[in-house]
Amino acid sequence: TQHGIRLPLRSGLGGAPLGLRLPRETDEEPEEPGRRGSFVEMVDNLRGKSGQGYYVEMTVGSPPQTLNILVDTGSSNFAVGAAPHPFLHRYYQRQLSSTYRDLRKGVYVPYTQGKWEGELGTDLVSIPHGPNVTVRANIAAITESDKFFINGSNWEGILGLAYAEIARPDDSLEPFFDSLVKQTHVPNLFSLQLCGAGFPLNQSEVLASVGGSMIIGGIDHSLYTGSLWYTPIRREWYYEVIIVRVEINGQDLKMDCKEYNYDKSIVDSGTTNLRLPKKVFEAAVKSIKAASSTEKFPDGFWLGEQLVCWQAGTTPWNIFPVISLYLMGEVTNQSFRITILPQQYLRPVEDVATSQDDCYKFAISQSSTGTVMGAVIMEGFYVVFDRARKRIGFAVSACHVHDEFRTAAVEGPFVTLDMEDCGYNIPQTDESTLMTGRA
């Protein structure tokens, strides 16, 4: 999921405690599948670094070999480095595992920016800061790769959490989460709280700070404020959803809603940016430019090349608009909206030329494969992937970066008619052409 960046991800990541936290609100919520309330053992189990992905610690094999694994809701393979590589501190050594089973089958996965290939097998897998279970799961042992692993990212593999339909080499390879649910009593649901730092983190800061939480099998109340609002999963391949309206500072972009979902809209933790179809991107940039016109920025900023910088601590957040995406609700003709701040869509990075200022990259970019709600969106929210009920929930994240004037928001209901018409029906073609390049 990659810069455009599809895999491996480029993200704006970081430490939960570093943003202002919102006060907890009380709310009544419907019953959920799975456990609710406190998942202390899983809270704060993610780490990450700006532009390089959120990862969780996992163990593979017997005796257990510990690896850091990128959490990716935009793919469906569990794949780990299994051979020496200059960017890997450690890798999965199958020969040392008494429980490894070879499937005698290869797998090749090309991305926009590189590729990996490997050998399929199964082994025992567990998540130390996750449910207290061990499962036998399919593992792609990566033996060769190009521009997949990232120098200094601190992760050695990828956990694809989407559905079997997009697994490689084909949909017969059961994804990890399916195996977990089948073999244990873990409910068919997980939730993610990705926490952006609000400023660039160096390697030691990343290791010392929290990147967020992946709650497996449930929902943790402490990770969000207000209510959870759910949107249906349109089709179980990627986590596909339907956007019905887009607003910049409350101004409707006024486009045919099909454009917002052309050719799909997905929620993808393995992509850094909010990626928008060409027409939507152009309209959104025009609107954001107009809203922030008190300052003029280089054209290269809007195109993702040039940074904008301000003297440390003087970023004029107030001149940038909020962005609202309206998502199809669970009830007929009802939608809800999620609103992100510039603190989410301006990604803190260091200027390679000078490091004294606060510099940012515009983290909204153009896509030819539909809308991708990447880390830029997810860092504002606690996101519940309720696979059991075929829906995705959004609530305001307790760790999102904001200021004293505005916070991210999840609000509803709104009346929206003919929302089904907003979905785009992809012509049935060879599924091998699926997007595997992300920014």
Epitope: Q113, K278, L303, Q306
Partner: antibody, heavy 120, light 108 residues
């Protein structure tokens, strides 16, 4: 330190096309933009367009629009500039240059140049 | 598009003397202006970016100043290797990223 290595000199007939490559050795194109700049004999520098690999589309100078196509293959860290319907006034040295990672958009690394001669 | 006008077109200077090159933009480019040096048969080389910051490895005798529409490149004491053509370039409003017409610094 990244270097941009361009393909060799070309001699072309009017009306034909030329495709020049630019490979990043010792580094990647990811996160940077690659511009194409040309210089006719004894003339100044002319920016033709650029591409930000992974970001989507290329950007072109109006003068170049229509005849120039800029692409990139991130898997090989190579950018390409194709110029079609060649005429004698396209005879020039074509440079690729890198920018990005900073607020200023300066072209900090240049290829060695590729001489394209258009002659019947 | 933004037009960059460089003056003079040719500057004749003796080694050891100071050279002052000018670049005027048709509209404000903030500090998004760079200066390049080009010698015959070679690719351009970045000297100054952000109007006033020297690129890595560029000697201190090169300095840039200005913002908005008026910019200056100064070479405090010309060395023999400094005789070349100098171009300014803006990257504020683009496409296109325009270059100035160049100033040739020659030996007097």
């Amino acid at each position: 330190q990244v270097q941009l290595v361009q393909s060799g000199a070309e001699v072309k007939k009017p009306g034909s096309s030329v495709k020049v490559s630019c490979k990043a050795s010792g580094g990647t194109l990811s996160g940077y933009a690659i511009s194409w700049v040309r210089q006719a004999p004894g003339q100044g520098l002319e920016w033709m367009g650029n591409i930000i690999p992974g970001f989507g589309t290329a950007n072109y100078a109006q003068k170049s629009q229509g005849r120039v196509t800029i692409t990139a293959d991130e898997s090989t860290s190579t950018a390409y500039m194709e110029l079609s319907s060649l005429r004698s006034e396209d005879t020039a040295v074509y440079y690729c240059a890198r920018s990005g990672g900073t607020r200023y958009g300066m072209l900090d690394v240049w290829g060695q140049g590729t001489m394209v001669t258009v002659s019947s | 598009e933004i037009v960059l006008t460089q003056s003079p077109a040719t500057l004749s200077v003796s080694p050891g003397e100071r050279a002052t090159l000018s670049c005027r933009a048709s509209q404000s480019v903030g500090s998004n202006l760079a200066w390049y040096q080009q010698k015959p048969g070679q690719a351009p080389r970045l000297l100054i970016y952000g109007a006033s910051t020297r690129a890595t490895g560029i000697p201190a005798r090169f300095s840039g100043s200005g913002s908005g529409t008026e910019f200056t490149l100064t070479i405090s004491s010309l060395q023999s290797e400094d005789f070349a053509v100098y171009y300014c370039q803006q990257s504020f409003v683009w496409p296109p990223r325009t270059f100035g017409g160049g100033t040739k610094v020659e030996i007097k």
